[in-house]
C-alpha cells in the first residue's frame, strides 16, 4: 500500500502548474454513491489534474460528477494556465475577470484583489488561502493589468506571458532555492511549518524547501498555513515534484520524483482544507 516507485520523467516547465481550482467541488473525491447502478461519469482528479472516468452508482455522490468529459473540462480545467491568456488585439478580458470574488473555504485570511465587473474596478477582498477562483490577484496592479480597461478601452497589458495558476502573477515568482533548482510546485510548499493557534498536538508533515524533504511537525489543530499534510506521501506528492533540476541551458527538464501507485478509486486526503 505504501509501496513507491522512483521514476525519471522528462517534463517541460509548464507541466504540473501549481493547482488552483475554478470551483471547490473540483477537489472532491470521486464518489460513486450508495446505489448499485453502473453509470459512466467523469470527475476531476486533483492529483493528475485531468478529468477521468469513474463508475457512478446512480444516486447521491457529489458535485464532482459530469455527464461528459467536455463538461468536466469546462468546469474544472483551465487550459489558460498553460497558454497565452489574451492579447490587446482581442480587446477582451479573460473570463475569470467576471467571476465573483471567492474567499474559498479556508480561514487563513489574506488581502487579495478581484475585478468587480459592476464597478469596473479592481477591489480588495479577504481570501481564505485555498481554493477560490482565478479572479484573485496578489496586487492591485496585477488585477488592473489583467482585468481593467485602459483609458481608451484597451486592455492595460499585452499578456504575452503565462499566468501562474496559483497566485495569478504574470511571471513566476523568484524563490530562494539553490540556483541549480527552480520551484514549480505550489507556493505554500516554500512556507515554514506553522503550528497554528490552538492547543492540540496532531502529527502532520510539512515540506522543508531548504533540504527538499518532508518532515514531521506538531500541528495545534487550527490556523497555520497550507504547508500541512496528514501523511508524508501527501506532502511528497504535493511538494516534492515541484522541486525540479534545470539542465544548464534551459530546454527540457529532468526530474526525479516519487509517485505513489494509485488504486482505481483514489483515496484523496483533503490537502487543501485546513482544520477550522
Amino acid at each position: 500500500d505504501s509501496e513507491e516507485d522512483e521514476e525519471h520523467t522528462i517534463i517541460t516547465d509548464t507541466e504540473l502548474p501549481p493547482l488552483k481550482l475554478m470551483h471547490s467541488f473540483c477537489a472532491f473525491k470521486a464518489d460513486d454513491g450508495p446505489c448499485k447502478a453502473i453509470m459512466k461519469r467523469f470527475f476531476f482528479n486533483i492529483f493528475t489534474r485531468q478529468c477521468e472516468e469513474f463508475i457512478y452508482g446512480g444516486c447521491e455522490g457529489n458535485q464532482n460528477r459530469f455527464e461528459s468529459l467536455e463538461e468536466c473540462k469546462k468546469m474544472c480545467t483551465r487550459d489558460n494556465a498553460n497558454r497565452i491568456i489574451k492579447t490587446t488585439l482581442q480587446q477582451e478580458k479573460p473570463d475569470f475577470c467576471f467571476l465573483e470574488e471567492d474567499p474559498g473555504i479556508c480561514r487563513g485570511y489574506i488581502t487579495r484583489y478581484f475585478y468587480n465587473n459592476q464597478t469596473k474596478q479592481c477591489e480588495r477582498f479577504k481570501y481564505g488561502g485555498c481554493l477560490g477562483n482565478m479572479n484573485n490577484f496578489e496586487t492591485l496592479e496585477e488585477c488592473k493589468n489583467i482585468c481593467e480597461d485602459g483609458p481608451n478601452g484597451f486592455q492595460v497589458d499585452n499578456y504575452g506571458t503565462q499566468l501562474n495558476a496559483v497566485n495569478n502573477s504574470l511571471t513566476p515568482q523568484s524563490t530562494k532555492v539553490p540556483s541549480l533548482f527552480e520551484f514549480h510546485g505550489p507556493s505554500w510548499c516554500l512556507t515554514p511549518a506553522d503550528r497554528g493557534l490552538c492547543r492540540a498536538n496532531e502529527n502532520r508533515f510539512y515540506y522543508n524547501s531548504v533540504i527538499g524533504k518532508c518532515r514531521p511537525f506538531k500541528y495545534s489543530g487550527c490556523g497555520g498555513n497550507e504547508n500541512n499534510f496528514t501523511s508524508k506521501q501527501e506532502c511528497l506528492r504535493a511538494c516534492k515534484k515541484g522541486f525540479i533540476q534545470r539542465i544548464s541551458k534551459g530546454g527540457l527538464i529532468k526530474t526525479k520524483r516519487k509517485r505513489k501507485k494509485q488504486r482505481v478509486k483514489i483515496a484523496y486526503e483533503e490537502i487543501f482544507v485546513k482544520n477550522m
Epitope: E100, E101, D102, T111, N116, Q118, E123, R124
Partner: antibody
Framework: EVQLVESGGGLVKPGGSLRLSCAAS????????MNWVRQAPGKGLEWVST????????YYADSVEGRFTISRDNAKNSLYLQMNSLRAEDTAVYYC???????????WGQGTLVTVSS | DVVMTQTPLSLPVTLGQPASISCKSS???????????LNWLQQRPGQSPKRLIY???KLDSGVPDRFTGSGSGTDFTLKISRVEAEDVGVYYC?????????FGQGTKVEIK
C-alpha cells in the same frame, strides 16, 4: 444619497429565531459586499458577518458561526440576517453596513434592536 | 484576533480646545499591499456610526478638516483641532487589515 434601513428586530426568547432585513437605496446595491455589525447595550461594536457582491460567499464571526446566516436579494436591494439558536449575549443593536472597494465599511444603517430574554 | 485599545475611554473637553484620542493595536496594521487599514468612526448620541477617517488619514466626504488621523504600525491618533458642540459622541477606531475586523472600546467625548 446612500441609505440603509434595518428592520425585523424585537424581543425573542433564548433558543428562538429572528430574521433581520436591511433595505438599501441610493447606490448600486449589487456592486458592493455588505456586512452586519452589532453593538450590545452600553458596549462597543462587533463585526458579525460579510457577504460578497453576488451573495455566493460569506464570512462569519466565530461567535455566530453555525447559528446566523447572512444572505442578500440583489433584485430587491435587500440584505438579510437569519438568526437561530439565539442567546442572551446576542442582545444588541444590529447595523447593516456597506463595504467599499478597500473592503472597509463606509456607510451604516440606523440599526435595529434585538433583545434575547426569557 | 487583533485587539484594539483606545485611550482615554472618556475625554471631557472645552469647546474650541483641541482633543486627542489614542488607538493601539496588538499587531501591526500594515497590510501586505503596503496600506494600513486603520479607520475611525463617530457615533453621535442616539445615532448610527458614521465613518470619519479611513486608511489612517483619509477624511470621508463631508468630514470637517478639523479632524486629522495619523500614525503607523500599531500606534494611531485621532485629533480634533478645535472641538465643536456637534463633535460630542463616541469615537471608535477599528482595523480592516486582519480578519475579522475588530474595534476599539470607544472614547466618549463630552463638553466640560
Amino acid at each position: 444619497e446612500v441609505q440603509l434601513v434595518e428592520s425585523g428586530g424585537g424581543l425573542v426568547k433564548p433558543g428562538g429565531s429572528l430574521r433581520l432585513s436591511c433595505a438599501a437605496s441610493g447606490f448600486t446595491f449589487h456592486s458592493y459586499a455588505m456586512n452586519w455589525v452589532r453593538q450590545a447595550p452600553g458596549k462597543g461594536l462587533e463585526w458579525v458577518s460579510t457577504i460578497t457582491t453576488r451573495g455566493s460567499y460569506t464570512y462569519y464571526a466565530d461567535s455566530v458561526e453555525g447559528r446566523f446566516t447572512i444572505s442578500r436579494d440583489n433584485a430587491k436591494n435587500s440584505l438579510y440576517l437569519q438568526m437561530n439558536s439565539l442567546r442572551a449575549e446576542d442582545t444588541a443593536v444590529y447595523y447593516c453596513a456597506r463595504q467599499d472597494g478597500n473592503f472597509l465599511m463606509d456607510y451604516w444603517g440606523q440599526g435595529t434592536l434585538v433583545t434575547v430574554s426569557s | 484576533d487583533v485587539v484594539m485599545t483606545q485611550t482615554p475611554l472618556s475625554l471631557p473637553v472645552t469647546l474650541g480646545q483641541p482633543a486627542s484620542i489614542s488607538c493601539k493595536s496588538s499587531q501591526s496594521l500594515l497590510d501586505v499591499d503596503g496600506k494600513t487599514y486603520l479607520n475611525w468612526l463617530q457615533q453621535r448620541p442616539g445615532q448610527s456610526p458614521k465613518r470619519l477617517i479611513y486608511l489612517v488619514s483619509k477624511l470621508d466626504s463631508g468630514v470637517p478638516d478639523r479632524f486629522t488621523g495619523s500614525g503607523s504600525g500599531t500606534d494611531f491618533t485621532l485629533k480634533i483641532s478645535r472641538v465643536e458642540a456637534e463633535d460630542v459622541g463616541v469615537y471608535y477606531c477599528w482595523q480592516g487589515t486582519h480578519f475579522p475586523f475588530t474595534f476599539g472600546q470607544g472614547t466618549k467625548v463630552e463638553i466640560k
